[in-house]
């Protein structure tokens, strides 16, 4: 598994560095999930053939994965920090099913898809220490998120490999519209 | 083999519309941020602005605000010159921005050969 | 919006020799968001260095960059012919969440 930020050699050696600000530790954060996602979508697509299923096959998917959309404030027209940050926490907590679901999707990235839910946690409280309004913030349903969990692992193996395949790609375009809004903040 | 190519730059009148598109191949275009970049002639290169294909989203340099609309398909990503004027003219080129690989961003890492903008009445 | 200016522009250097090229920002950086790219006449940018200092797939490791915060450098040593071009930084910043080229460098390789 990759070094978490903030921990790798060049960091240390290097204490005449500016610390970094609180959005650049978000940043390196996201990058650093990134880069896990980056390892498990190589190991899916290896396995199986869904990188290569055609976007019609996979948009017919009933998958509620989150996704920013112009109202959330996220992009540069109508950009609103506090709506977005909202947007991005309640995006990622939805997506902690998702990721317990890829938990026992991988042989040889099993500690890499840990690492990713881990770091997640981890970006979680970093952008609730950031936000304001935390009474916005709705957090999914625990009764809700079992069921779901229960749903999905009960599929057949192609809608599984179908499965683990969205959501990585999925919550890859989230942490990646979710960059360059967190870059204004 | 992964291209970009631009094309659809000519000669327009200053206020006349003008898209250009910006086709990839062997890239998913989802899994990319796509920006835009021009060069006057004999002058230095200046940033436009991005498109994160997956989502949609765009992010225009301030002095491109308003000038400026780079939209995608799931093969191309245009860029609109709203309103042209003679300080458009340029080449204007496409370039993929290599965030996929292992969370390193900003860096344009495959760039078209650029298609030619001339404005002038 | 942020400028990078670059130093010094034209530079001239001998086949061997090694040329530094200085690229410093109106603002920090965002996360050492800075780019370095090579430029022939009629050819499009080719990226060397990012993240100020990581070389880029199958760029010859006499490329070299530095820097952090305002202050970036671009070092070529063993300066060959093939090296003659105009060179430009980018840097990327989280004012407007703006990107912006510096105004290159011509190096002549003597």
């Known amino acids: 598994a990759p070094v978490p930020p903030g921990e790798d050699s060049k960091d240390v050696a290097a204490p005449h560095r500016q610390p970094l600000t609180s959005s650049e530790r978000i940043d390196k954060q996201i990058r650093y999930i990134l880069d896990g996602i980056s390892a498990l979508r190589k190991e899916t697509c290896n396995k199986s053939n869904m990188c290569e299923s055609s976007k019609e096959a996979l948009a017919e998917n009933n998958l509620n994965l989150p996704k920013m959309a112009e109202k959330d404030g996220c992009f540069q027209s109508g950009f609103n920090e506090e709506t977005c940050l909202v947007k991005i926490i309640t995006g990622l907590l939805e997506f902690e099913v998702y990721l317990e679901y890829l938990q026992n999707r991988f042989e040889s990235s099993e500690e890499q898809a840990r690492a990713v839910q881990m770091s997640t946690k981890v970006l979680i409280q970093f952008l609730q220490k950031k936000a304001k309004n935390l009474d916005a913030i709705t957090t999914p349903d625990p009764t809700t998120n079992a069921s779901l969990l229960t749903k999905l692992q009960a599929q057949n193996q192609w809608l599984q490999d179908m499965t683990t395949h969205l959501i990585l790609r999925s919550f890859k375009e989230f942490l990646q519209s979710s960059l360059r809004a967190l870059r204004q903040m | 083999c992964q291209s970009v190519e631009e094309s659809g730059g000519r000669l327009v009148t200053p206020g006349t519309p003008l898209t250009l598109t910006c086709t990839v191949s062997?890239?998913?275009?989802?899994?990319?941020?796509m920006s835009w970049v021009r060069q006057a002639p004999g002058k230095g290169l200046e940033w436009i602005g991005i498109i994160y294909a997956g989502s949609g989203s765009t992010w225009y340099a301030s002095w491109a605000k308003g000038r400026f609309t780079i939209s995608k398909t799931s093969t191309t990503v245009d860029l609109k010159i709203t309103s042209p004027t003679t300080e458009d003219t340029a080449t204007y080129f496409c370039?993929?921005?290599?965030?996929?690989?292992?969370?390193?961003?900003?860096?344009?890492?495959?760039w078209g050969p650029g298609t030619l903008v001339t404005v002038s009445s | 919006a942020a400028v990078l200016t670059q130093t010094p522009s034209p530079v001239s250097v001998p086949v061997g020799g090694t040329v530094t090229i200085k690229c410093q920002s109106s603002q920090s950086v965002y996360n050492n968001f800075l780019s370095w790219y090579q430029q022939k006449p009629g050819q499009p940018p080719k990226l060397l260095i990012y993240?100020?200092?990581k070389l880029a797939s199958g760029v010859p490791d006499r490329f070299s960059g530095s820097g952090s915060g305002t202050q970036f450098t671009l070092t070529i040593s063993g300066v060959q012919c093939d090296d003659a071009a105009t060179y430009y930084c980018l840097g990327g910043y989280d004012d407007d969440a703006d990107n912006a080229f510096g105004g290159g460098t011509e190096v002549v390789v003597k």
């Open positions: 062997g890239i998913d275009l989802s899994d990319y941020a």
């Open positions: 370039a993929r921005d290599g965030y996929d690989d292992y969370g390193d961003f900003d860096r344009l890492d495959l």
């Open positions: 993240q100020a200092s």
